[in-house]
Interface confidence: low
Amino acid sequence: GIAIPRNSGCPNSEDKNFPRTVMVNLNIHNRNTSTNPKRSSDYYNRSTSPWNLHRNEDPERYPSVIWEAKCRHLGCVKADGNVDYHMNSVPIQQEILVLRREPRHCPNSFRLEKILVSVGCTCVTPIVHHVA
Amino acid sequence: GIAIPRNSGCPNSEDKNFPRTVMVNLNIHNRNTSTNPKRSSDYYNRSTSPWNLHRNEDPERYPSVIWEAKCRHLGCVKADGNVDYHMNSVPIQQEILVLRREPRHCPNSFRLEKILVSVGCTCVTPIVHHVA
């Protein structure tokens, strides 16, 4: 991380392992003042690599609900609606940060956790290895 | 949010706005014990809706570096390598949580923030209305 100068206007920390444990305000600030117009809400259906969204819920996590994408087909959908198995539908994955209650059930103590989620699917050309 | 019972083994909080401000341990626990074998590292190049990755850096944010996808074409790449403008490359976007230093430059005080990031691109059929 970046070395940040100490600032007299900052909250104090008594933690001997500081800055490993920090104070976090859970009043979420949303940087996206309006929904992005290029809305992805229906892309899961219109994509040549369509996907279904599955609800992943965990009350010990913040956010407790995360939606996971699962590609519908192994191949990609052609203009005629049939699946082309010479192409592959693959999940686009992203590592995201979540807060995990630690110790368990504690309302005000969390550990930062990285989880891998599938956000959607894309159609790729398969890697084919030809033996000489 | 979920109502969590108070637990005698939990750290105490003196914050009058509790549980809006919580303690977070920044020693990240990575739930993905091994790198996902279906790694998406080269999908950006092999996709029919390929994308470039742009580095978005902000020292006041945690994580400070986020990679943003930007679709390379308006259309989608056909098997012959040409772009088909009857189809559209669109970004798959996801809202993610980050920590924003607040007050600014403070090393041990953060606010949770939601930001919208483009993770990759997918190829979709455009919405077109034909007048009878």
């Epitope: 940087r31 309006s34 117009p37 290029k38 | 742009h54 919405i127 034909h130």
Partner: antibody, heavy 124, light 111 residues
Framework: EVQLLESGGGVVQPGRSLRLSCAAS????????MHWVRQAPGKGLEWVAV????????YYADSVKGRFTISRDNSKNTLYLEMNSLRPEDTAVYYC?????????????????WGQGTTVTVSS | QSVLTQPPSASGTPGQTVSISCSGR????????VDWYQQVPGAAPKLLMY???IRPSGVPDRFSGSQSGTSASLAISGLQSEDEADYYC???????????FGSGTKVTVLG
């Protein structure tokens, strides 16, 4: 020929209202997102509002939010801008413009067709 | 004050190359594609470039566009007298939730 024709401009007192119209021809109007853009005398272009092809989504510049309303009537091939609580700083030439791609695009293909503009003067 | 910054003016003699910059931030140029418009005095704007570097049909190949990071630029090579006009960059801005125009650059052809 693809054409956009604005009308409804004029001189109006501060605090009053005005409704601009933009008649579209030569393309399937209901397929395209539409914008209003204005230009004050001697100044640069300022984006005002956009509406999706089906009218379900609308976005406004902060300077007009809560005062202006963009709407469309696809059966009449017409785009509208309802302007309330007008201020002297709203004085400008108002252009309507068409998004360059059909469907759920707001800007990616640029604004490829513009009207000739209609002048709005807000003065007491 | 526009969120997309352009130089107020640029000039060159016929045949020269003139470049116009457009500086933005992550929420606009960093994430979205840039359009360029040309406006000659007394006329409506005309789309000159979209998607950073694609010219609509009818726009001469003397005009070229590029983008890098949070900046974009328009180059006019082989400058001609009819290129004398105001040029605006534009794109979507996620923070503002709207389309934004640059401050505009007046291009003058000298001599």
């Amino acid at each position: 020929e693809v054409q956009l024709l604005e009308s409804g401009g004029g001189v109006v007192q501060p605090g009053r209202s005005l409704r601009l119209s933009c008649a579209a021809s030569g393309f399937i109007f209901s397929n395209y997102g539409m914008h209003w853009v204005r230009q004050a005398p001697g100044k640069g272009l300022e984006w005002v509002a956009v509406i999706s092809y089906d009218g379900s989504n609308k976005y406004y510049a902060d300077s007009v939010k809560g005062r202006f309303t963009i709407s469309r009537d696809n059966s009449k091939n017409t785009l509208y801008l309802e302007m309330n609580s007008l201020r002297p700083e709203d004085t400008a030439v108002y252009y309507c413009a068409k998004v360059g791609a059909s469907g759920d695009y707001y800007y990616s293909y640029g604004l490829d067709v513009w009207g000739q503009g209609t002048t709005v003067t807000v003065s007491s | 004050q526009s969120v997309l910054t352009q130089p107020p003016s640029a000039s060159g003699t016929p045949g020269q190359t003139v470049s116009i910059s457009c500086s933005g931030r992550q929420s606009n140029i960093g994430r979205h594609y840039v359009d360029w418009y040309q406006q000659v005095p007394g006329a409506a704007p005309k789309l000159l470039m979209y998607y950073d570097s694609i010219r609509p049909s009818g726009v001469p190949d003397r005009f070229s566009g590029s983008q890098s990071g949070t900046s974009a630029s328009l180059a006019i090579s082989g400058l001609q007298s009819e290129d004398e006009a105001d040029y605006y960059c534009a794109t979507w801005d996620d923070s503002l939730g709207g389309y934004v125009f640059g401050s505009g650059t007046k291009v003058t052809v000298l001599g």
